[in-house]
């Protein structure tokens, strides 16, 4: 028994629902007293849901499970996640038996934006050419973790002197703060790009330090 | 009607190795799943191994894993059970049988005996 | 030791109703069907009830099985002498993807 599944992972945003999608071809005949169903996590075959002699079995995943009950018979076994959670990435086996049997595998890669970066410095006043200054970059509730990039006002990376910490949350979500230590220019932009690798989404924070009245030594 | 034939059970020593086949006629080989199950002398039903119609995908019990290995040929209508690294533990009668509904089995052989004895 | 529990006997006279019990957990009998097999002496095993309750054809109406939860059962009614045999319930393991058969249960005609 063919059973299909998409090839690449169902990406689902924190606390929105997902269709983890599954699909087999009904013989001519067929009725839904045949069809058991087994939905479970792939590596710990935990119980997710299941369908059972023509009954929805419910789910055994926290009651965020639920399938289609008017596409079964027509082949379609997908399974709706309700508000996503970062603890539900992985993957999920979609496992059918009839008169014969087949599963399949589908991933879930769960993600979540990260805010615009807050931008601190540290000294933050009497600046003067020369001086080491700190300059942090912070972002919040995004996965997975980030990529974190340094750029002056011309674009150029700055790759030296940063240091990235990433903290999860209790819910499993990242707060990424980039310190960069530079020695000051006359003036000049420092920008910080918190990058999500899976929603392909930037978040850029900038500071400038301008108009200083420096004198050069 | 619908049959199951096993064969190639025997004695062998622990550590050997056996064959056994079970030719199928009367349904549409193919479109079934198959399984293996075995009986101990005077015990109860075990449950071995299961193979789908096309082949692709395999259930063993734990007790077998990495020892034994269900195969088919649907061009001949034969399931197969090779048996490796045998144990006295492994004496049975060995039964071929049809996948059915709701993980039943409708069809049975009249199986075939392995004993694994020095 | 089976995943599913039996009585290993029973016991009944003619024309009587016998049941025998059949218990599991929420990863077998709680999650897909129970199916129950008839073996009469020195013969193979042979298909009693399906999905919990369905016979298949061929199989008298005297035989009947339900299911609840993670118990199922087995019921003879009008006992015959032919009765006389080994039962056994079977299911599929959802956490462990294998198939289970229970102890088996020696049904004695007297």
């Known amino acids: 028994l063919e059973v299909q599944v998409p090839e690449d992972p169902v990406v689902a945003l924190v606390g929105t629902d997902a269709t983890l999608c599954c699909s087999f071809s009904p013989e001519p005949g067929f009725s839904l007293a045949q069809l058991n169903l087994i939905w479970q996590l792939t590596d710990t075959k935990q119980l997710v849901h299941s369908f059972a002699e023509g009954q929805d079995q419910g789910s055994a995943y926290a009651n965020r499970t639920a399938l289609f009950p008017d596409l079964l018979a027509q082949g379609n076994a997908s399974l709706r996640l309700q508000r996503v959670r970062v603890a539900d990435e992985g993957s999920f086996t979609c496992f059918v038996s009839i008169r014969d049997f087949g599963s399949a595998a589908v991933s879930l890669q769960v993600a979540a934006p990260y805010s615009k970066p807050s931008m601190t410095l540290e000294p933050n006043k009497d600046l003067r050419p020369g001086d080491t200054v700190t300059i942090t970059c912070s972002s919040y509730r995004g996965y997975p973790e980030a990529e974190v990039f340094w750029q002056d006002g011309q674009g150029v990376p700055l790759t030296g002197n940063v240091t990235t910490s990433q903290m999860a949350n209790e819910q499993g979500l990242f707060d990424v703060h980039s310190v960069l230590r530079v020695v000051l220019g006359a003036n000049g932009t420092y920008s910080c790009l918190v990058r999500n690798p899976v929603l392909q989404q930037d978040a850029h924070g900038s500071v400038t330090i301008t108009g200083q009245p420096m004198t050069f030594p | 009607e619908v049959q199951l034939l096993e064969s190639g059970g025997g004695l062998v020593e622990p550590g050997g190795s056996l064959r056994l086949s079970c030719a199928a006629s009367?349904?549409?080989?193919?479109?079934?799943?198959m399984h293996w199950v075995r009986q101990a002398p005077g015990k109860g039903l075990d449950w071995v191994a299961v193979?789908?119609?096309?082949?692709?995908?395999?259930y063993y019990a734990d007790s077998v894993k990495g020892r034994f290995t269900i195969s088919r040929d649907n061009s001949k209508s034969t399931l197969y059970l090779q048996m490796n690294s045998l144990r006295a533990e492994d004496t049975a009668v060995y039964y071929c049988t049809k996948y059915y509904y709701n993980y039943a089995m409708d069809v049975w052989g009249q199986g075939t005996t392995v004993t694994v004895s020095s | 030791q089976s995943v599913l529990t039996q009585p290993p006997s029973a016991s009944g006279t003619p024309g009587q109703r016998v049941t025998i019990s059949c218990s599991g957990s929420r990863t077998d009998i709680g999650t897909t069907s129970v199916n129950w097999y008839q073996q009469l002496p020195g013969t193979a095993p042979k298909l009693l009830i399906y999905q919990s309750h369905q016979r298949p054809s061929g199989v008298p109406d005297r035989f009947s099985g339900s299911k609840s939860g993670t118990s199922a059962s087995l019921a003879i009614s009008g006992l015959q002498s032919e009765d006389e045999a080994d039962y056994y319930c079977a299911s599929w393991d959802a956490s462990q993807n294998t198939w289970v058969f229970g102890g088996g249960t020696k049904l004695t005609v007297l």
């Open positions: 193979i789908n119609g096309e082949g692709s995908g395999t």
């Open positions: 009367g349904f549409s080989f193919s479109s079934y799943g």
